[in-house]
Structures are given as structure tokens and as C-alpha cells.
Interface confidence: low
């Protein structure tokens, strides 16, 4: 070609028109072009319709082209990657109809001040979205609803002051979230759902440490090894997790995860209390991590946040209380349970030896606590036995978390899903509205027998028991190559709730409570 360099690369025809001072698409490009580089030209405006003759085009680079307007007309049915970074776009064109197969969209370093409702409608295949370095102040609710396959999301270096509570709902594959260097002061309750988010970048925001930050504090404590600092140009091997990088703006850079929350209401102090989200509890088996989450429930509120699943985990999980007002998507309901006045569910249950086993109905037969644990090979899909795992006596981190082994830093922004295999089974859909059960019933749902050999409470001691406790069904899957230390935090802190259904604790659980 007289202007551009044409190369055959595997089954692709790659055309490199970079840095040619072009003001328009060069004529007579090969019709079977699959990859087209138009970077660093002076296009100013560009119409995607001009590319319609190139029916095999899978990748288009239009970065650094001084673009102020991108016209979206026609359809490029197989275009998977579009790089619009480092331009002058002030609005994001609606690409869904034109680019139905798009998997990577990079609009970093433009001049976007807002995104329209439905900005991503039609982009159901999108896996990576980079919006770093724009001027976004808010995001429309439901922005990412059309992109359930999203894996990497960069919103770093914008002017975001708040995030929609349900922004991440349904993003079961999300592994990297970059929110650093914004103007965020809090994270809405339930924001992270039950996702396992391996790479989160949250530093450089003016976090306001007050009672509203307690949900975020708890999430940071439970995900300390997944919080990183973005350092441009630093070798990946030097990158370690750094949860202390997330700092209170109003407390002399005090780490948010250590914020004491003194004076914040606890359950029983105020009627309008709320929940933490459910977090995954993990224990390791050789080089595998088995993720198990268990639900215990004292229902007083209807919790309607739809939880995303990571791989094929159950949506049920351990939870703990969170003082604050109702989530926007929650509605207050009549209290369904009344506990004795002296019952203060502000306790922690450390399960030093705990066994979960699936049973068809509740039983009152004691289950002896195991004293040794045998490693179990790859669990069958219906297997729900959790081997005993030593549990630390303190459930929350009190010192700087140890750096996790050299973990990849996200790319341009990111792309660090290292070499983790794809999930082998489709996650079950997660319900969005739980059905409240007016009458305590447990006979119809599978239960878990819990044998706890030692119980520790902050203020009282009592006899241990092997009396079985009936809990909601817990499922577990094996996730290879998540190299994390074993932990089973069996923590019950007060008010617990499930997003899936509404079982009550077995009445025998009264005997484990400090009276």
C-alpha cells in the first residue's frame, strides 16, 4: 500500500497507518484487513461507516488522533477491540448498535464529563472498559447492566464523588476494579456484593471516616490482600497488596481498615440498623482454595441487593452487622423476630473446629467435633463437607497485612487476570428480591450441622457444646490457583441476613448465646 504498511500476521491482515499525518481513512486499504492502526494521526472527526467495507475488521486503533467526534453509523459486526484513548471526545458515542461484538473499549484520557443513560446498551460482549483520565463526576445507575461479562473496569483519575450502589451488580466475572485518584468519600453499603475481586485500586480518594464507612472498612479488612497501589512504570514484581493505602481524609491519613468506629450505633442501640454484605470465607486445600459461605439469619430487614456470584459459589454467606440506614434498594419490613432484652448479638464465634454437613432436615442428635482433619481430594459438585481449619483468635487484622506474593498489576490500566483458568460451570443466576418468610421454618430446607469446639466471646464465657446448629445450606467449589493463606473466620456478628431465602436459626442456637 502506498501509505500504510501491510503485514500478514497468522490469519490476520494487519495494516499499520500510524503517524502518517492522515486526516481521513486512506483509500484502497485491503478489503480483508482485520487489524487497522490509525494511531497518532490528525483525524479530528471519524465515521465508523467508512470502515463498513472491511467486513473482517476485528481491531481498530484510533488513539491519539485528536478526535473530537466519532460518528457511529453502520455496523462493524466482528470488531472486538476499539482504542479511542488520548483523544478529545467530550461524550461517549452509543456504540452498541454499531459494534455488537466489542470486547475491549478504551476511552481513557479523553474529556468525558458524563455518560448518558444506556451508554453501553448493546455491548453485551464487553470484557474490558477503560475510562481512566476523564472528567467524570457521576455515573448513571445501571451503567454496567448491559455488560455482564465485564472483567476489567477502570474509572481511575476522574472526578467521581460517589458511586451508584448497584454499579457492580451482576458482574460475576469482574476481577479488576480501578477507582484510584477520584474524589470518592464513601462506598455505598452492599457495593461489592459477594464478588471476589482479586485486584482493587482505591487509593488517592478523600475517604470520610465516619459511621457510614463501616461497610467499606469491613470489606477492606476481609479483602486486604486484594487492595493494591497503582504505580505507573513500577515492575510487577515490586507490587504488593497495600490495604493501608486506603486512608481517611479526615483523620490524618489513618488507614480506613483500622478505623475504630467509636460511637457508631450497634444493633440494639438504634432501630435503623443495617447489614454488612456477605463475604466469602476461604480455606485452602493444598494449592486450591475452597470457598465456602454460610448464611445465618436473624431477619429484621428485607435485603434486596442482587448478589453477583464469582464462579459457581452459592449466594449464601456469613455476614455481620453494619450500623447505618437502609440501602436505597431496601425496604423496611415488620420485625419478624424478637429476642430477649438481655440478648445482645454483639459477639464473635470463633470456630476452631467446624464441620458442615448437608442433611435433609434438622436433627437434635449431637455431632462429635472432629479432632483431626484429612485433606479431601477435589470435591464432587454436591459435596458440602468443610474440613476443620484452625482459625486465628482475632478475626480482624490488627497489623499491616503481609504483602501477598508478587501479584500482577493491571495493565493499561489493567489486565492482570494472570493465568487463572476460566470457570468450568456457569454461575447460577442470583435472585434480586428475597421472599420474607413470616413464620420460622427450617424443616423444608437442607441444613448444616455445626460443631464448634471452642467459643470465645468478648464479655462472657460459657460451656462449649456439640449440639448441632441448623444453618442454611452452604456450597463449596474449588477455585484453582488462588494462592492465599488458609482462613476460616467463622464470624457471626449480630444481625445476619441472606439474599436468597429466609430460614431462621434453629431454636437450639439459643444455647450458644451469652445470656
Amino acid at each position: 500500500h502506498p501509505i500504510c504498511e501491510v503485514s500478514k500476521v497468522a490469519s490476520h491482515l494487519e495494516v499499520n497507518c500510524d503517524k502518517r499525518n492522515l486526516t481521513a481513512l486512506p483509500p484502497d486499504l485491503p478489503k480483508d484487513t482485520t487489524i487497522l492502526h490509525l494511531s497518532e494521526n490528525l483525524l479530528y472527526t471519524f465515521s465508523l461507516a467508512t470502515l463498513m467495507p472491511y467486513t473482517r475488521l476485528t481491531q481498530l486503533n484510533l488513539d491519539r488522533c485528536e478526535l473530537t467526534k466519532l460518528q457511529v453509523d453502520g455496523t462493524l459486526p466482528v470488531l472486538g477491540t476499539l482504542d479511542l484513548s488520548h483523544n478529545q471526545l467530550q461524550s461517549l458515542p452509543l456504540l452498541g448498535q454499531t459494534l455488537p461484538a466489542l470486547t475491549v473499549l478504551d476511552v481513557s484520557f479523553n474529556r468525558l464529563t458524563s455518560l448518558p443513560l444506556g451508554a453501553l446498551r448493546g455491548l453485551g460482549e464487553l470484557q474490558e472498559l477503560y475510562l481512566k483520565g476523564n472528567e467524570l463526576k457521576t455515573l448513571p445507575p445501571g451503567l454496567l447492566t448491559p455488560t455482564p461479562k465485564l472483567e476489567k473496569l477502570s474509572l481511575a483519575n476522574n472526578n467521581l464523588t460517589e458511586l451508584p450502589a448497584g454499579l457492580l451488580n451482576g458482574l460475576e466475572n469482574l476481577d479488576t476494579l480501578l477507582l484510584q485518584e477520584n474524589s470518592l468519600y464513601t462506598i455505598p453499603k452492599g457495593f461489592f456484593g459477594s464478588h471476589l475481586l482479586p485486584f482493587a485500586f482505591l487509593h488517592g480518594n478523600p475517604w470520610l471516616c465516619n459511621c457510614e464507612i463501616l461497610y467499606f472498612r469491613r470489606w477492606l479488612q476481609d479483602n486486604a490482600e486484594n487492595v493494591y497501589v497503582w504505580k505507573q512504570g513500577v515492575d510487577v514484581k515490586a507490587m504488593t497488596s497495600n490495604v493501608a493505602s486506603v486512608q481517611c481524609d479526615n483523620s490524618d491519613k489513618f488507614p480506613v481498615y483500622k478505623y475504630p468506629g467509636k460511637g457508631c450505633p450497634t444493633l440494639g442501640d438504634e432501630g435503623d440498623t443495617d447489614l454488612y454484605d456477605y463475604y466469602p470465607e476461604e480455606d485452602t486445600e493444598g494449592d486450591k482454595v475452597r470457598a465456602t459461605r454460610t448464611v445465618v439469619k436473624f431477619p429484621t430487614k428485607a435485603h434486596t441487593t442482587p448478589w453477583g456470584l464469582f464462579y459457581s459459589w452459592s449466594t449464601a454467606s456469613l455476614d455481620s452487622q453494619m450500623p447505618s440506614s437502609l440501602h436505597p434498594t431496601q425496604e423496611s419490613t415488620k420485625e419478624q423476630t424478637t429476642f430477649p432484652p438481655r440478648w445482645t448479638p454483639n459477639f464473635t464465634l470463633h470456630m476452631e473446629s467446624i464441620t458442615f454437613s448437608k442433611t435433609p432436615k434438622s436433627t437434635t442428635e449431637p455431632t462429635p467435633s472432629p479432632t483431626t482433619s484429612e485433606p479431601v481430594p477435589e470435591p464432587a459438585p454436591n459435596m458440602t463437607t468443610l474440613e476443620p481449619t484452625p482459625s486465628p483468635t482475632t478475626p480482624e487484622p490488627t497489623s499491616e497485612p503481609a504483602p501477598s506474593p508478587t501479584t500482577p498489576e493491571p495493565t493499561s490500566e489493567p489486565a492482570p487476570s494472570p493465568t487463572t483458568p476460566e470457570p468450568t460451570s456457569e454461575p447460577a443466576p442470583s435472585p434480586t428480591t428475597p421472599e420474607p418468610t413470616p413464620i420460622p421454618t427450617i424443616a423444608t430446607s437442607p441444613t448444616i450441622l455445626v460443631s464448634a469446639t471452642s467459643l470465645i466471646t468478648p464479655k462472657s464465657t460459657f460451656l462449649t457444646t456439640t449440639k448441632p446448629v441448623s444453618l442454611l445450606e452452604s456450597t463449596k467449589k474449588t477455585i484453582p490457583e488462588l494462592d492465599q493463606p488458609p482462613k476460616l473466620r467463622g464470624v457471626l456478628q449480630g444481625h445476619l441476613e441472606s439474599s436468597r431465602n429466609d430460614p431462621f436459626l434453629h431454636p437450639d442456637f439459643c444455647c450458644l448465646l451469652p445470656l
Epitope: E5, S7, V9, A10, H12, E14, N16, D18, I35, H37, S39, Q59, N61, D63, T81, D83, V104, D106, E151, K152, K231, Q232, G233, V234, D235, V236, M239, P408, E409, P410, T411, S412, P414, A415, P416, S417, P418, T419
Partner: nanobody, 124 residues
Framework: EVQLVESGGGLVQAGGSLRLSCAAS????????MGWFRQAPGKERDFVAG????????YYADSVKGRFTISRDNALNTVYLQMNSLKPEDTAAYYC?????????????????WGKGTLVTVSS
């Protein structure tokens, strides 16, 4: 600036296997699309395989499909090329390549950084 250093080349009999490694140093290598090229004596440098930043997407030249596998370990800043069922026509100097712009396959004209190469000789 990224420095790329290849290793693992050598002499192998036809039908044998080799694993090439490309160790990268400098800026964050997970920012880069990585690839392998090869240049047989007296011939042009040809694309062999390419891999996305996350390692999820991979592309191969038709001549190596099914025999070669590209992979990367971002934690170790290393890209690998596992070469099985080697043939005498695979004899060449193998070069590691890195490119920052988006895209998995690339012509050598779009490579930002090259390694110095490692020699693979397949004897019949």
C-alpha cells in the same frame, strides 16, 4: 524502557520439545501485549504467537498452531513459548516482542520492544 531477555533455546531432535522464556524488566510488563517472532537464516522475521495482557487471548501463526503454546506469568514478568513436535523448519532465532497498544496479534512494525533472540536448532 522494557528489556526483554530470551532463554531456553538449543539443539533438539525433530519431534522433541523446548520451552522458551522471555524475562522482562523495566516498566510493568502486564501493560504490554507480548509475542514471539522468529527469523530463519536469510529470511524475514515472522510472527509466531501473541498473547493479550491478561493472558486470556492468544493467537498463533498457522504453521505452529496445535504445536506451540504461548503463556505468560505477569507475577514473574515472564512470557513462555512451549514448543512441541518440533520440525527442522522451526529452526530459527526466536525473538520476544512487547507492544503497549491494544491488540493481540501484531506485525513487527508495531512492536515497541524486542529481545536479542535465542537460537533454536532442530535436527532431523
Amino acid at each position: 524502557e522494557v528489556q526483554l531477555v530470551e532463554s531456553g533455546g538449543g539443539l533438539v531432535q525433530a519431534g522433541g520439545s523446548l520451552r522458551l522464556s522471555c524475562a522482562a524488566s523495566g516498566p510493568t510488563v502486564s501493560n504490554y501485549y507480548m509475542g514471539w517472532f522468529r527469523q530463519a537464516p536469510g529470511k524475514e522475521r515472522d510472527f509466531v504467537a501473541g498473547i493479550s495482557r491478561s493472558g486470556v487471548e492468544k493467537y498463533y501463526a498457522d504453521s505452529v498452531k496445535g504445536r506451540f503454546t504461548i503463556s505468560r506469568d505477569n507475577a514473574l514478568n515472564t512470557v513462555y513459548l512451549q514448543m512441541n513436535s518440533l520440525k527442522p523448519e522451526d529452526t530459527a532465532a526466536y525473538y520476544c516482542a512487547a507492544r503497549e497498544r491494544v491488540g493481540i496479534t501484531f506485525a513487527h512494525s508495531t512492536v515497541d520492544y524486542w529481545g536479542k533472540g535465542t537460537l533454536v536448532t532442530v535436527s532431523s
